[in-house]
């Protein structure tokens, strides 16, 4: 970190990687919740035209696919993996790909994935061959 760039503000240390370099934020698709036509496919594109620089360097990309009796939605955001999202821990946040895993939610089918490469939540993967662990 160069000396002229403040290392600490209000005791909040700048995020650095393990060689001391400043951690730069990643890029994520960020359309919040949109209606989706993604259904019964091995993978889908988000169809989100908004790519944002995540606000915080520690944030990762997240996608949430939900289906109920009325519609299908896809949510794309940046989120801090230290914090739960929709009451679930982002256990796959270090993955370079967004591999969807089903979560238990009453009244709907709910899949979520997180990943840590640029725009990785643009391509969401449901295919079983990628899933090495059982859904929650």
């Amino acid at each position: 970190i160069p000396p002229h760039v403040q290392k600490s503000v209000n005791n909040d240390m700048m995020v650095t990687d393990n060689n001391g370099a400043v951690k730069f934020p990643q890029l994520c698709k960020f359309c919040d919740v949109r209606f989706s036509t993604c259904d019964n496919q091995k993978s889908c594109l988000s169809n989100c035209s908004i790519t944002s620089i995540c606000e915080k360097p520690q944030e990762v990309c997240v996608a949430v696919w939900r289906k109920n009796d009325e519609n299908i939605t896809l949510e794309t955001v940046c989120h801090d993996p230290k914090l739960p999202y929709h009451d679930f821990i982002l256990e796959d946040a270090a993955s370079p790909k967004c591999i969807m895993k089903e979560k238990k939610k009453p009244g709907e089918t709910f899949f979520m994935c997180s990943c840590s490469s640029d725009e990785c939540n643009d391509n969401i993967i449901f295919s079983e061959e990628y899933n090495t662990s059982n859904p929650d």
Epitope: I1, D17, N18, N19, A21, V22, F24, L27, I53
Partner: nanobody, 122 residues
């Protein structure tokens, strides 16, 4: 030796415009991803814009989207930030920055200019 030198900062009224420049040397500028990062008084770093190379794709933080434009002139080894519709909350030191892999997976060296101060006030 990598050097990044920002210029173009100053005092501007709300609603005004400024164009920042960053002169780069010591590396192959035309192949590098470049960033503009700012630090408001008493605040942390805010990464506001990135431009890739090749291709020149540009990205913005929500706080500046639609108001700021990042660009580069590879023939002049210079990075630019055009700032329009400036607000008081844009007051900050603006840095240009680059990073390159260390060779160890997932880690980077980062390089920073000395910064240029932008003050938006009436």
């Amino acid at each position: 030796e990598v050097q990044l030198l920002e210029s173009g900062g100053g005092l501007v009224q709300p609603g005004g415009s400024l164009r920042l420049s960053c002169a780069a040397s010591g590396f192959t500028f035309g192949t590098e991803q470049m960033w503009w990062v700012r630090q408001a008084p008493g605040k942390g770093l805010e990464f506001i814009s990135r431009i890739d190379s090749p291709g020149g794709r540009t990205y913005y933080a929500d706080s500046v989207k639609g108001r700021f434009t990042i660009s580069r002139d590879n023939s002049k080894n210079t990075l630019y930030l055009q700032m329009n519709s400036l607000r008081a909350e844009d007051t900050a030191v603006y840095y240009c920055a680059k990073r390159r892999p260390t060779g160890v997976s997932g880690t980077f060296y980062d390089y920073w200019g000395q910064g240029t101060l932008v003050t938006v006030s009436s």
